[in-house]
């Protein structure tokens, strides 16, 4: 094979290639959470396994500190899914006034961080009413989309309530990108 | 266009170069599952229809006996959508001793079976509680991540029911994965 | 580097190799959606932010009048997320001759339109009862998966009730697609 | 309107093969699938098994398994059920059924044939 | 293996109601489908009454319902007349994703 065999017909003039497998990559597990300290109004973000297990980060893809950092700029997909787990939720049988109230709810962010810029960006949202009827619960949020993200740019996902994610396995909780 | 344009400026040594077209790829969708025993305690696996209507395998992937062959080794996309469908479960209902009974629920598994490993590896899981109210219920589960596959690893989707999985139309029910 | 070193020890042909950066890709976000005409039995069309925000559209992939314009034929990966909203769904309550009624449900359909053929292609569905007690309620239902498509095939994402749509940010409701 | 309409009464040695079809028309007949039961004497229904018309995909209840083929002509929109290795206990009127999607309920039925196992 | 019962009989006058029964041996009977009612009048292939524990196909007068609690479903006729008199079939899907069939129930409209 020649090189000029690689340029396609229309002789359009591509950015320089590179080999699929050494792109920046990592899909993180989740571990059980430390109690800290947050915010009222600020949802907590997840620490993860990056090396265990399910778990690796590759080609210069670090988790540092609940962090994923983007290591080089292009398009990323991006994706977790968390699972929720919790005792009934009692919002259908509590009214005020006969109105029905506000219901409990169950929310992940996958979220942006860019020194340069004073406020985390929103890159996607599951969240979900909970009002379950006569037992336990527990389900799954799943989110997935790409990216045009910078070099320096990192990633975390935040979730509405702690206490209410399933750390007891691998492949129920977990969160990834790689550039694609 | 001359094979040196495609070195990057820092020099960094690649892994040989191949076009995207040729890289393993497979969308699977549902089938009707045939009547078949399975171990009390073990997740059924599904079978899928893999060169009809959407379903395609391309690029040395495999589908053979419910498992997806992985055909070089690699970092692959996995995903999988499976509609269930019910009718009402009443665990609402029945409580024992006033306090709720265990829920019932709803569980997809895409697991690795290792052949030189003795144990499959559970990938993914989502799993959800299922306590409808009134009338017959249907909802999907997703999933979809990142893993590093070897070749000769098999990939299968189990449930934890396989009468209550929706296998009326390809769209609903579907098991894909793609070498990244 | 010489061009011959990207040829892989088997000697296989591979198609003519291109940069990841210049492929077809998009990520379209939620609207505040216009009151339109729609068939009674046919799911009406989201319409979609395709440059501000986190939206955008990238290498000859357009959009336009509610569709996603694949400009190149290949295996590409679709995606979408719709948050759904609404009140309570009174499905559980009211009971005709002591039999439960039909459920409410939410529906998304990622459509694909071949302008050779006469009916669209219903590629992915995520479908879900809804009903909910005592509360107002909010749902997310993710699609993604991947699909061999022809150049000039349109996508579109349809959803069964537009009113329940949760248009209010960005990372709630969203379509994308990009060329593996 | 939906119509099954299914071959005529047979009568085989114990042994012999026995190749029941039903022509459907009416509908998109590789739509639905075709399920086949089948009634004893003065006796209850039994479930045979299900043909997906449009993929050749089959369903056999494990009592008949390695003794019962389903297959289907799209060409004539017609299924196929043949039953070998018959027995006495074979002689039943075997119908063809189209299913609900949704339910697998089986909402057409065929008029039924009778097929006898007789030495 | 699974079981779906029924009363091998039951019988009423003309006008009267009756209920047949369809009780499962296992509980997992049903989950998916439901449970489905067909109506075999003498000499006739069968006809499909009830689907889904419930719902009545277009044609089916509204003297059949069904219901559903626990374990068991049940098929009601109310305002009985002599041509409802045949066997009546309950059937499902087990875990194995089998069909079955009850054991049917003849009915009888007295007088």
């Known amino acids: 094979l020649k090189g000029q065999e690689f340029a396609p017909s229309h002789q359009q003039v591509y950015a320089p290639l590179r080999a699929d497998g050494d792109k920046p990559r990592a899909h993180l597990t989740v571990v059980r959470q430390t109690p800290t300290q947050h915010f009222k109004n600020q949802f907590p973000a997840l620490h993860w396994e990056h090396e265990l297990g399910l778990a690796f980060t590759k080609n210069r893809m670090n988790y540092t500190n609940k962090f994923l950092l983007i290591p080089e700029s292009g398009d990323y997909f991006i994706y977790s899914q968390v699972t929720f787990r919790g005792m009934t939720s009692e919002c259908s049988e509590i009214r005020q006034a006969g109105r029905p109230n506000k219901p409990d709810s169950i929310t992940v962010v996958i979220t942006k961080v860019t020194d340069s810029y004073p406020e985390p960006t929103q890159l996607l949202m599951g969240t979900k009413s909970v009002c379950e009827v006569g037992s336990n619960w527990f389900q799954p949020i799943y989110l997935g989309a790409m990216f045009s993200l910078q070099e320096g740019d990192k990633l975390m996902v935040n979730v509405s309530d702690i206490s209410l994610v399933d750390y007891t396995k691998e492949d129920k909780t977990f969160f990834g990108a790689f550039l694609l | 266009l001359k094979g040196q344009e495609f070195a990057p400026s820092h020099q960094q040594v690649y892994a040989p170069l191949r076009a995207d077209g040729d890289k393993p790829r497979a969308h699977l969708t549902v089938v009707r599952q045939t009547p078949t025993q399975h171990f009390k305690n073990q997740f059924p696996a599904l079978h899928w229809e893999h060169e009809l209507g959407l379903a395609f395998t391309k690029n040395r992937m495999n589908y053979t006996n419910k498992f997806l062959l992985i055909p070089e080794s690699g970092d692959y996309f996995i995903y999988s959508q499976v509609t269930f469908r019910g009718m009402t479960s009443e665990c609402s209902e029945i409580r024992q001793a006033g306090r709720p009974n265990k829920p019932d629920s709803i569980t997809v598994v895409i697991t690795k079976v290792t052949d030189s490993y003795p144990e499959p590896t559970q990938l993914l899981m989502g799993t959800k509680s299922v306590c409808e109210v009134g009338s017959n219920w249907f909802q999907p589960i997703y999933l979809g991540a990142m893993f590093s596959l070897q070749e000769g690893d098999k990939l299968m989707v189990n449930v934890s029911d396989i009468s209550l999985v929706d296998y009326t139309k390809e769209d609903k029910t579907f098991f894909g994965a793609f070498l990244l | 580097l010489k061009g011959q070193e990207f040829a892989p020890s088997h000697q296989q042909v591979y198609a003519p190799l291109r940069a990841d950066g210049d492929k077809p890709r998009a990520h379209l976000t939620v609207v505040r959606q216009t009151p339109t005409q729609h068939f009674k039995n046919q799911f009406p069309a989201l319409h979609w932010e395709h440059e501000l925000g986190l939206a955008f559209t990238k290498n000859r992939m357009n959009y336009t009048n509610k569709f996603l314009l694949i400009p190149e034929s290949g295996d590409y990966f679709i995606y979408s997320q719709v948050t759904f909203r609404g009140m309570t769904s009174e499905c559980s309550e009211i009971r005709q001759a002591g039999r439960p009624n039909k459920p409410d449900s939410i529906t998304v359909v990622i459509t694909k339109v071949t302008d050779s053929y006469p009916e669209p292609t219903q590629l992915l569905m995520g479908t879900k009862s809804v009903c909910e007690v005592g509360s107002n309620w909010f749902q997310p239902i993710y699609l993604g998966a991947m699909f061999s498509l022809q150049e000039g095939d349109k996508l579109m994402v349809n959803v069964s009730d537009i009113s329940l749509v949760d248009y209010t940010k960005e990372d709630k409701t969203f379509f994308g697609a990009f060329l593996l | 309107q939906v119509q099954l309409v299914q071959s005529g009464a047979e009568v085989k040695k114990p042994g012999a093969s026995v190749k029941v079809s039903c022509k459907a028309s009416?509908?998109?007949?590789?739509?639905?699938?075709i399920n086949w039961v089948r009634q004893a004497p003065g006796q209850g229904l039994e479930w045979m098994g299900w043909?997906?018309?449009?993929?050749?995909?089959?369903g056999y209840a494990q009592k008949f398994q390695g003794r019962v083929t389903m297959t289907a002509d799209r060409s004539t929109s017609t299924a196929y059920m043949e039953l070998s290795s018959l027995r006495s206990e074979d002689t039943a009127v075997y119908y063809c059924?189209?299913?609900?999607?949704?339910?697998?309920?089986?909402?057409?039925w065929g008029q039924g044939t009778l097929v006898t196992v007789s030495s | 293996q699974s079981v779906l019962t029924q009363p091998p009989s039951v019988s009423g006058a003309p006008g009267q109601r009756v209920t047949i029964s369809c009780t499962s041996s296992?509980?997992?009977?049903?989950?998916?489908?439901?449970v489905h009612w067909y109506q075999q009048l003498p000499g006739t292939a069968p006809k499909l009454l009830i689907e889904?524990?419930?719902n009545r196909p277009s044609g089916v007068p509204d003297r059949f319902s069904g219901s559903k609690s626990g374990t068991s479903a049940s098929l009601t006729i109310t305002g009985l007349l002599p041509e409802d008199e045949g066997d009546y079939y309950c059937?499902?899907?087990?875990?194995?994703?089998?069909?079955?069939f009850g054991g049917g129930t003849k009915l009888t409209v007295l007088g």
């Open positions: 059924a189209r299913e609900v999607p949704e339910t697998a309920a089986f909402e057409y």
């Open positions: 009416g509908y998109t007949f590789t739509s639905y699938d």
């Open positions: 043909l997906n018309p449009n993929s050749g995909n089959t």
């Open positions: 296992s509980s997992d009977i049903g989950a998916g489908s439901g």
């Open positions: 889904g524990y419930y």
């Open positions: 059937q499902s899907y087990d875990g194995t994703l089998s069909a079955l």
